[in-house]
Amino acid sequence: CSCSSLMDKECVYFCHLDIIWVNTPEHVVPYGLGSPRS
């Protein structure tokens, strides 16, 4: 997976968990086991 910033500690930590990357109007967000807070 890829995070928009390697400084995003949470993204880097969770990104291996079968995350599928999807585009939103604002930015790229992860959607995996659950979902990012809307």
Partner: antibody, heavy 118, light 108 residues
Framework: EVQLVESGGGLVKPGGSLRLSCAAS????????MNWVRQAPGKGLEWVSS????????YYADSVKGRFTISRDNAKNSLYLQMNSLRAEDTAVYYC???????????WGQGTLVTVSS | EIVLTQSPGTLSLSPGERATLSCRAS???????LAWYQQKPGQAPRLLIY???SRATGIPDRFSGSGSGTDFSLTISRLEPEDFALYYC?????????FGGGTKVEIK
């Protein structure tokens, strides 16, 4: 000293709701990812849900997805689990656990018992 | 879902003996994502090992973890009376996070 104290468990009828709380102390709560793990009577451990430190990433086990909601209030050093549409198979001791940023849970509360029965 | 199979289900040993517990994954798990916990009756689990082989804070050096891929193990070099308990492995490498079924280490 790190402490996690769960509350809110009890007896509820099938289809009912409960809200569990976990009060954290002894560490900077807002810096840690948190989790709920449950254990049915006489059974093994089952991961329920995870929430990242800022609440940006929220994950659920398939068995609870759509029925349970995890949340946190960093200002109150508290973790929550809203449980709706409860089923008999949700009967368990529910533990909150701190994720230590090493892909494991280094501190656990003592648990709160949820019993779903008519 | 990664299924973790622990064996044996029960291990009957005497204090001072060596205990070797196995955790086999249904698919490969990076060693970074494998942990071991101890649980005693009526108590919450306690983290022993993370990253397959790193001891958690305060864990005695008689506990050691090893393994990679699909086969992991927890070794207790010399059993102390307080070590008789349930032991669980857990993987954090794939969704959902899963625990093994546990191994009970009992006094022979």
């Amino acid at each position: 000293e790190v402490q996690l104290v769960e509350s809110g468990g009890g007896l509820v009828k099938p289809g009912g709701s409960l809200r569990l709380s976990c009060a954290a102390s002894g560490f900077t709560f807002s810096s840690y990812n948190m989790n709920w793990v449950r254990q049915a009577p006489g059974k093994g451990l089952e991961w329920v849900s995870s929430i990242s430190s800022s609440s940006s990433y929220i994950y659920y086990a398939d068995s609870v997805k759509g029925r349970f909601t995890i949340s946190r209030d960093n200002a109150k050093n508290s973790l929550y689990l809203q449980m709706n549409s409860l089923r008999a198979e949700d009967t368990a001791v529910y533990y909150c656990a701190r994720d230590n940023w090493n892909y494991s849970f280094d501190y656990w509360g003592q648990g709160t018992l949820v019993t779903v029965s008519s | 879902e990664i299924v973790l199979t622990q064996s044996p289900g029960t291990l009957s040993l005497s204090p001072g003996e060596r205990a070797t517990l196995s955790c086999r994954a249904s698919q490969s798990v990076s060693s970074s994502y494998l942990a071991w916990y101890q649980q005693k009756p009526g108590q919450a689990p306690r983290l022993l090992i993370y990253g397959a082989s790193s001891r958690a804070t305060g864990i005695p050096d008689r506990f050691s973890g090893s393994g990679s891929g699909t086969d992991f193990s927890l070794t207790i070099s010399r059993l102390e009376p307080e070590d008789f308990a349930l032991y669980y492995c857990q993987q954090y490498g794939s969704s959902p996070l899963t625990f093994g079924g546990g191994t009970k280490v009992e006094i022979k």
